[in-house]
Interface confidence: low
């Protein structure tokens, strides 16, 4: 109980910054929560004059900000890095923009991957 | 889940600080770390939030240029700076979990005073 | 976003039912949490997600409330309740505490 309807149970997993602190550079997270916890799922990036570079993809626990987020949707109007959760095996896989002040959302594909396993 | 604050500090004006928050009993980097501010005999002031996972921090506006956030994920460690305190700094600062600030450090009482 | 906390101080006897409200200068849902805190000690949350009561606290404490306005009660005052009250929208930037709402003994 205390879980919302989409249970995170397993999120894409991406590092940009690996290689400094040894982990994996891609693949596939699985979340593990505090009892009577939500999970989710977050990405984070940077928007460069229209280039996207991916900081961080993964597990998120418990934040209210992602309760009930089905896509992971970044509200804020102009971040340094852009940040978004949501709930459900790998919702964060694409990432959209939608300033809550308006204007055009911008969809985030990735590129087809074999990911791996994280354990 | 236990949040420990560094001990009380005594500066004058114009000196520099920074102040730790260390976590355990969770990952630290699941959780955004929040920081508020309690001015002797006040209310509680919301001063940010930093998310450890890539030290992207949100400033209130009243505190945005006068303090730094900033973590370090080896330690599980967050931290409040400031490269010149005022007399009006003096203040008990809590660091605390999450965005609804579910668990809190003890707080550290910060004097500045010539 | 200002919150705004109604009263900022009242009396009560221990056993009395005690109501204390927020109101939000806009919508917030309900991205409200209240908290308790006593004279020298560590503000302790009480409610999160407006109505949702944290593990560990007493059940005379509720919230209710969503959108603009929200309210903490405790039913059946007792004499460890006797504290400030704050809530705390986290919903925008900046994240903002009502100004608190002292609760004495009458």
């Known amino acids: 109980s205390g879980r919302g309807e989409a249970e995170t149970r397993e999120c894409i997993y991406y590092n940009a910054n690996w290689e400094l602190e040894r982990t994996n550079q891609s693949g596939l997270e699985r979340c593990e929560g505090e009892q009577d916890k939500r999970l989710h799922c977050y990405a984070s990036w940077r928007n460069s004059s229209g280039t996207i570079e991916l900081v961080k993809k993964g597990c998120w626990l418990d934040d209210f900000n992602c309760y009930d987020r089905q896509e992971c949707v970044a509200t804020e109007e102009n971040p340094q890095v852009y940040f978004c959760c949501c709930e459900g095996n790998f919702c964060n896989e694409r990432f959209t923009h939608l300033p809550e002040a308006g204007g055009p959302e911008v969809t985030y594909e990735p590129p087809p991957t074999a990911p791996t396993l994280l354990t | 889940v236990q949040l420990v604050q560094s001990g009380a500090e005594v500066k004058k004006p114009g000196e520099s600080l920074k102040i730790s928050c260390k976590t355990s009993g969770y990952t630290f980097t699941h959780y955004w770390i929040g920081w508020v501010r309690q001015m002797p005999g006040k209310g509680l002031e919301w001063m940010g939030r930093?998310?450890?996972?890539?030290?992207?921090?949100d400033y209130s506006p009243s505190f945005q240029g006068h303090v730094i956030m900033s973590v370090d994920k080896s330690v599980s460690t967050a931290y409040l700076h400031w490269n010149s305190l005022k007399a009006s700094d003096t203040a008990m600062y809590y660091c605390?979990?999450?965005?609804?600030?579910?668990?809190w450090g003890q707080g550290t009482t910060v004097t500045v005073s010539s | 976003i200002q919150m705004t906390q109604s009263p900022s101080a009242m009396s009560a006897s221990v056993g009395d039912r005690v109501t204390i409200t927020c109101r939000a200068s806009q919508g917030i849902s309900n991205y409200l949490a209240w908290f308790q805190q006593k004279p020298g000690k560590v503000p302790k949350r009480l409610i999160y997600?407006?109505?949702s009561l944290q593990s560990g606290v007493p059940s005379r404490f509720s919230g209710s409330g969503s959108g603009t306005e929200f309210t903490l009660t405790i039913t059946s005052l007792q004499p460890e309740d006797f504290a400030t009250y704050y809530c705390?929208?986290?919903?925008?930037?900046?994240?903002?505490f009502g100004q608190g709402t002292k609760l004495e003994i009458k």
């Open positions: 997600a407006a109505s």
């Open positions: 930093i998310n450890p996972t890539d030290s992207y921090a």
């Open positions: 705390l929208q986290h919903k925008s930037y900046p994240y903002t």
């Open positions: 605390a979990r999450g965005t609804a600030l579910g668990v």
